[in-house]
């Protein structure tokens, strides 16, 4: 059965907290991803960026969550209209920014 929106958001926040707290070496070997516009469709936008990171065990669960929560199919290399034009950041910074935004959404009760 589908994950309730509040549960999905809470689980994703918990996983991102886990990643940031357990980070030792550079996350995903310092891989860079497109920065995204966090104001709309956050699950799909985040997935469209993070799906282009391969071989990073630390974010595999996050990728699975986003893939489950995003209602449409996303593939690596897909152009995202939601990305911030020509701006790439490290995965570690992406995760931190995403976490801050998701915590804000949770506090405001915006679960969808």
């Amino acid at each position: 059965s589908p994950v309730p929106p509040s549960t999905a958001l809470k689980e994703l926040i918990e996983e991102l907290v886990n990643i940031t707290q357990n980070q030792k070496a550079p996350l995903c070997n310092g891989s860079m991803v497109w920065s995204i516009n966090l104001t709309a469709g956050v699950y799909c936008a985040a997935l469209e960026s993070l799906i282009n990171v391969s071989g990073c065990s630390a974010i595999e669960k996050t990728q699975r969550m986003l893939n489950g929560f995003c209602p449409h199919k996303v593939s690596a290399g897909q152009f995202s209209s939601l990305r911030v034009r020509d701006t790439k950041i490290e995965v570690a910074q992406f995760v931190k920014d995403l976490l801050v935004h998701l915590k804000k959404l949770f506090r405001e009760g915006q679960f969808n």
């Epitope: 994950v3 070997n29 990171v53 391969s54 630390a58 893939n67």
Partner: antibody
């Protein structure tokens, strides 16, 4: 062009050790994961283990005590070592790359045949 | 480990007909609403080739006569219509958990 090539000893004595190297080209081992899979003659595929781009290693439970997987990313090589070999370890050993998420194995080497016999 | 059981072990299908291969998992391979089940084709003397990922998504370059379906523990690979070049052994594989596993394989013969 993505390529993987296994190289092994061919023949190993029972009780001995096996070392196989997977040399890759067309991609980097720092951001791709490599699996090891074997296939005994006339039988099915068995997943042995994998090494992730970020260095994490997962092993098949049944073989964990006899297996060791490592890599040298600068040389584009992944290594499989197996100890205490038995005749039923005779197989073709493949290395295979994980693609992007959801991490199915999208490129395979041609395999190297290993016979365990005295 | 999750055990994958394929059936039948072998089947013979006439050219142009439909071939159906089943894969049953000992426990669910679903995670966050997606099924982490993939299908491979292996022809004699060759390494396996990825056909379908996430239960139903066709890998790039794979003909549309191949399709996959299923969720949780029950999955199906369908080839319709079967062509002569489809003679091969087909394997399901899961990566729902860290220890990946393959099914035992199904050998397809074309009549």
């Amino acid at each position: 062009e993505v390529q993987l090539k296994e190289s092994g000893p061919g023949l190993v004595a029972p009780g001995g050790s096996l070392s196989i190297t997977c040399t890759v080209s067309g991609f980097s081992l720092t951001d791709s994961s490599i699996n090891w899979v074997r296939q005994p003659p006339g039988k099915g595929l068995e997943w042995l283990g994998m090494i992730w781009g970020d260095g994490r290693i997962d092993y098949a439970d049944a073989l964990k005590s006899r297996l060791s997987i490592s890599k040298d990313s600068s040389k584009s090589q992944v290594f499989l070592e197996m100890t205490s070999l038995r005749t039923d370890d005779t197989a073709t050993y493949y290395c295979a790359r994980d693609g992007y998420f959801p991490y199915a194995m999208d490129f395979w080497g041609q395999g190297t045949s290993v016979t365990v016999s005295s | 480990d999750i055990v994958l059981t394929q059936s039948p072990a072998s089947l013979a299908v006439s050219l142009g007909q439909r071939a159906t291969i089943s894969c049953r998992a000992s426990e669910s391979v679903d995670s966050y609403g997606q099924s982490y089940m993939h299908w491979y084709q292996q022809k004699a003397g060759q390494p396996p080739k990825l056909l379908i990922y996430l239960a139903s998504n066709l890998e790039s370059g794979v003909p549309a006569r191949f399709s996959g379906s299923g969720s949780r523990t029950d999955f199906t690979l369908t080839i319709d219509p079967v062509q002569a070049e489809d003679a091969a052994t087909y394997y399901c594989q899961q990566n729902a958990e860290d220890s990946r596993t393959f099914g035992g394989g199904t050998k397809l013969e074309i009549k």
